[in-house]
């Protein structure tokens, strides 16, 4: 079907006073919500830095790329994007930096083509376990999401609920097994102290996982074994001290993997020997020549690849009677 070129929705920025007059009506094919910019030729609507407090009701049906960044949405209710007829083409939705602190169950329901979702830079104190799955069924309908960007969504300390932030995020990722098709997951800059052990096993399609700039101390209980499609694993700028044999073997067994480990406080003692041996042999670590020791003090800034077993000693543990106070 040929769209009429003469009356196609051109770039437009609607006058604010029109909003109330049309918001209750079904959207016209070529209208643009107040305070937004629209291009049907680019299938894009941008409502950026406009201090919007709710999602516009009169979004054009052609929208494939929707930018609602830099607003003051606060709460994303159930069916926030549900329209009649539905926004059947919406594929990429960017809500970053819009002061969202609550995303309710079913917020993204009725978006059958939604492939990319960015909620970054929102202080998400309350992310419903069913935000992405839409229902509390043990097995939900598969979500079409392929990329989920959740960088810097940790709220300030005083706004957090009395529960684990990591647990809240993981519950939303795993609910109803809806995100089995997810290929890219970004969770950078969220102050994560740990990664719940079951999260990766239930996201088998992952190609790209970004956990950079968190506070992860250990990967001991995290299994990468099922992530046979994983291509990139970003672990830069965490608090990792050492990677143990089990983790090293699992990473080495992934056929397409590239691992990024820069800027972690590696502890170069006897427990590091296996990792150093592995680093010298593996091709999976990008920039492995940049990895340096942080502790103990005598080893600070030593390059891991240049260490040998004689460098990696552990101070003997003194029996209690010989320990000094």
């Amino acid at each position: 079907s040929s769209s009429p070129t003469s009356s196609a929705s051109s770039f437009s920025s609607s006058a604010p006073f029109l909003a109330s007059a049309v918001s209750a009506q079904p959207p016209l094919p070529d209208q643009c919500p107040a305070l937004c910019e629209c291009s049907e030729a680019a299938r894009t609507v941008k409502c950026v830095n406009r201090n919007l407090t709710e999602v516009p009701t009169d979004l054009p049906a052609y929208v494939r790329n929707l930018f609602l960044t830099g607003n003051q949405l606060a709460v994303l209710p159930a069916g926030a994007f549900a329209r009649r007829p539905p926004l059947a083409e919406l594929a990429a939705l960017n809500l970053s930096g819009s002061r969202l602190d609550e995303v309710r169950a079913g917020a993204f329901e009725h978006l059958p083509s939604l492939r990319q979702l960015d909620l970054s830079h929102n202080p998400l104190a309350d992310l419903s376990p069913f935000a992405f799955s839409g229902s509390n069924a043990s097995v939900s309908a598969p979500s079409p999401l392929v990329e989920l960007i959740l960088n810097h969504i940790v709220p300030p300390e005083d706004e957090r609920q009395n529960r684990s932030f990591e647990g809240m995020v993981v519950a939303a990722l795993l609910a109803g097994r809806a995100l089995q098709g997810l290929r890219r997951l970004e969770l950078a800059s969220n102050h994560f102290l740990y990664l719940p052990r079951d999260v990766l096993a239930q996201l088998p399609s992952l190609r790209h996982l970004d956990l950079s700039n968190n506070s992860l101390v250990s990967l001991t209980y995290v299994s990468f074994r099922n992530l046979t499609h994983l291509e990139s694993l970003h672990l830069e700028d965490n608090a990792l001290k050492v990677l143990h044999n089990g983790t090293l073997a699992e990473l080495q067994g992934l056929p397409h993997i590239r691992v990024f480990l820069d800027n972690n406080p590696w502890v170069c003692d006897c427990h590091m020997a296996d990792m150093v041996t592995w680093l010298k042999e593996t091709e999976v670590v990008q920039g492995k020549d940049r990895l340096t020791c942080a502790y103990p003090e005598k080893m600070r800034n030593r390059v891991l690849l240049e260490l040998n077993s004689a460098d990696l000693d552990c101070d003997p543990i003194l029996p209690p009677s010989l320990q000094t106070s």
Partner: antibody
Framework: QVQLQQWGAGLLKPSETLSLTCAVY????????WSWIRQPPGKGLEWIGE???????NYNPSLKSRVTISVDTSKNQFSLKLSSVTAADTAVYYC????????????????WGQGTTVTVSS | EIVLTQSPATLSLSPGERATLSCRAS??????LAWYQQKPGQAPRLLIY???NRATGIPARFSGSGSGTDFTLTISSLEPEDFAVYYC?????????FGQGTRLEIK
Amino acid sequence: QVQLQQWGAGLLKPSETLSLTCAVYGGSFSGYYWSWIRQPPGKGLEWIGEIDHSGSTNYNPSLKSRVTISVDTSKNQFSLKLSSVTAADTAVYYCAAWFGELWDYYYGMDVWGQGTTVTVSS
Amino acid sequence: EIVLTQSPATLSLSPGERATLSCRASQSVSSFLAWYQQKPGQAPRLLIYDASNRATGIPARFSGSGSGTDFTLTISSLEPEDFAVYYCQQRSNWPLTFGQGTRLEIK
């Protein structure tokens, strides 16, 4: 990495129909908008039209009465037909893709075919 | 249709110099504008999309700016391989249109 390979007749007589096909390799066919663009010798670029995965088309008004763009999703191919050609249609014809669904979405054609030189001469 | 006017038509500079190319639209195109580079006998190559975002693999010396009707492509320090023809293109409205091009030549 998506690649486009195009082919079709390079020498036409006036009043004949230009017919070009572009095959898509290595990518999701449904994610893109498929365009045809032409460039007369020594001149700039002219957009002919585009089609999306659903078959929805948009054409340049200056060529609309003569142009048909179609898609064959089973073969991952899309085609251009331009009827009643004249010498003014002599140009290099490019197929190109714009991905409308990637997070780093492009407003430009980010993948191009190699170009087919079409000469219209009696 | 939206007319894009590029200036200058030809720009003569030496390697290492800074190049500034302009594109003006006959009506607002928001940020729905792309820049391409074309070398003789080759298809155009996308440099910048959405007015200011570098496409994958494009060197950092290329930058785009502008919104509405006035746009600029800047090449901070010209390399020998940068001498080519540059086109702007809008995707705000159908028909999609290109500027007439700016030829960047070696002085």
